[in-house]
């Protein structure tokens, strides 16, 4: 079942995913100048039966100015540098990653890609939360965020991390104001909910080894 | 309590556009997403698409890509969804339904009829 | 895509019947929800998550299924039942309906 709201938003942190759950989407988006092919389907989706799971159906970009074929086109400078991270971003993912029964690894990039990933997860998925370079956490509980479904509604778990910069003093500093809790949920269930965009994420490679060496950048 | 109300029906002409908006009270209308539902007269429900209204976000139907443009105005809690080309089987009621699962709420829809 | 398949189309019945839906996905799905629709009104939420009465909803409407194969059932049909009937999954995208079940009178 689709999350039909958002992993929370906390202020200057990053949010991934390790592994995605059987029935997560990951939208098949092209850059600038490149679109799907016709052909092609407009997601990628993890599958998988009792033993393995993999991505299926391919993303594929073809110029926009061409008709109907998959050339290759020689990227710009600044393009080959994205393709570059992106590739390397893979590479390390694939050291970092566990295999999970049931669930998919990051999907490997596809030429012309766009620099955003749209991720649709489903319910169960788990995300891990990190603070941004330049701010260090304050635990009060688990760094993640779970979706869940209570009376056919999905509803993300807070997580229990707040950033501060390295220069703020050591204290829990006053989070963000929290949306309304849907109605029907008590507030005691929902801590905080955030049902805006799907999970556009951007792939940037991390300053840091420590945690994530593959980061996701919550838009 | 929750609502949704939507526009008025519409007649239009084929080839011209129109827009149809969905007013949410009741909730935090940036907390949900809002759904495009299409039923042409005698048929059945088709989904077209959603926004999340903080961001702006869409996603499709792809049958309905270049068919519909959902919008959402934050400040007065209203969601549109703009119906482009219109053709004599864009004729159909359409309605808002408030996401975050399934669908709990519903607009009372809006007959777009397209006749020369 | 996946396909919803609902049998019968149409179901003549009396008040006091027991009456099945059955809907059919191409693919296996993780929940079906049900929604009743009476002519001119909008959809209703019936059923949530294969089996769970949404709010309001009398008792003798009920829901089971797993995979590709699910079903509602009204076991003593009133009169205010006869209305069309659709099943919904929202697995995966595009969102999907059957194509409706009316349950009229006998």
């Known amino acids: 079942e689709l999350c039909d709201d958002d992993p929370p938003k906390i202020t200057h942190a990053t949010f991934k995913a390790v592994a995605y759950k059987e029935g997560t989407m990951l939208n098949c988006e092209c850059k600038r100048g490149f679109r799907r092919i016709k052909s092609g389907s407009p997601y990628m989706l993890c599958t998988g039966n009792s033993s393995h799971s993999s991505w299926d159906n391919q993303c594929q970009c073809t110029s926009s100015a061409a008709r109907n074929t998959t050339k290759q086109v020689t990227p710009q400078p600044e393009e080959q540098k994205e393709r570059k991270t992106t590739e390397m971003q893979s590479q390390m993912q694939l050291a970092d990653q566990v295999s999970l029964p049931g669930h998919c690894r990051e999907p490997p990039p596809w030429e012309n890609e766009a620099t955003e990933r749209i991720y649709h997860f489903v319910v169960g998925q788990t995300v891990y939360y990190q603070c941004v370079q330049g701010y260090r956490a304050l635990h009060r509980g688990p760094a993640e965020s779970v979706c869940k479904m209570t009376h056919g509604k999905t509803r993300w778990t807070q997580p229990q991390l707040i950033c501060t910069g390295e220069t703020e003093p050591s204290q829990f500093p006053g989070e963000e104001e929290p949306q309304a809790s849907p109605d029907g949920l008590p507030e005691s269930e929902t801590s905080r909910l955030v049902t805006t965009t799907d999970f556009r994420i951007q792939t940037e490679v991390a300053a840091t080894m420590e945690t994530f060496i593959f980061t996701t950048e919550y838009q | 309590q929750v609502q949704l109300v939507q526009s008025g029906a519409e007649v239009k002409k084929p080839g011209s556009s129109v827009k149809v908006s969905c007013k949410a009270s009741?909730?935090?209308?940036?907390?949900?997403?809002m759904h495009w539902v299409r039923q042409a007269p005698g048929q059945g429900l088709e989904w077209m698409g959603y926004?999340?209204?903080?961001?702006?976000?869409?996603e499709y139907n792809q049958k309905f890509k270049d068919k519909a443009t959902i919008t959402a105005d934050e400040s007065t809690n209203t969601a549109y969804m703009e119906l482009s080309s219109l053709r004599s089987e864009d004729t159909a009621v359409y309605y808002c339904?408030?996401?975050?699962?399934?669908?709990?709420?519903w607009g009372q829809g809006t007959l777009v009829t397209v006749s020369s | 895509d996946i396909q919803m398949t609902q049998s019968p189309s149409t179901l003549s019945a009396s008040v006091g019947d027991r009456v099945t839906i059955t809907c059919s996905a191409s693919?296996?799905?993780?929940?079906m929800h049900w929604y009743q629709q009476k002519p001119g009104k909008a959809p209703k939420l019936l059923i949530y998550?294969?089996?769970n009465l949404a709010s309001g909803v009398p008792a003798r409407f009920s829901g089971s299924g797993s995979g590709t194969e699910f079903t509602l059932t009204i076991s003593s049909l009133q009169p205010d039942d006869f209305a069309t009937y659709y099943c919904?999954?929202?697995?995966?995208?595009?969102?999907?309906f059957g194509q409706g079940t009316k349950v009229e009178v006998k």
């Open positions: 339904a408030r996401g975050g699962g399934v669908f709990d709420y």
């Open positions: 009741g909730y935090t209308f940036t907390s949900y997403r």
């Open positions: 926004i999340s209204p903080r961001k702006g976000y869409t």
């Open positions: 693919s296996s799905i993780s929940y």
């Open positions: 998550t294969t089996s």
């Open positions: 919904h999954q929202r697995s995966t995208y595009p969102l999907t």
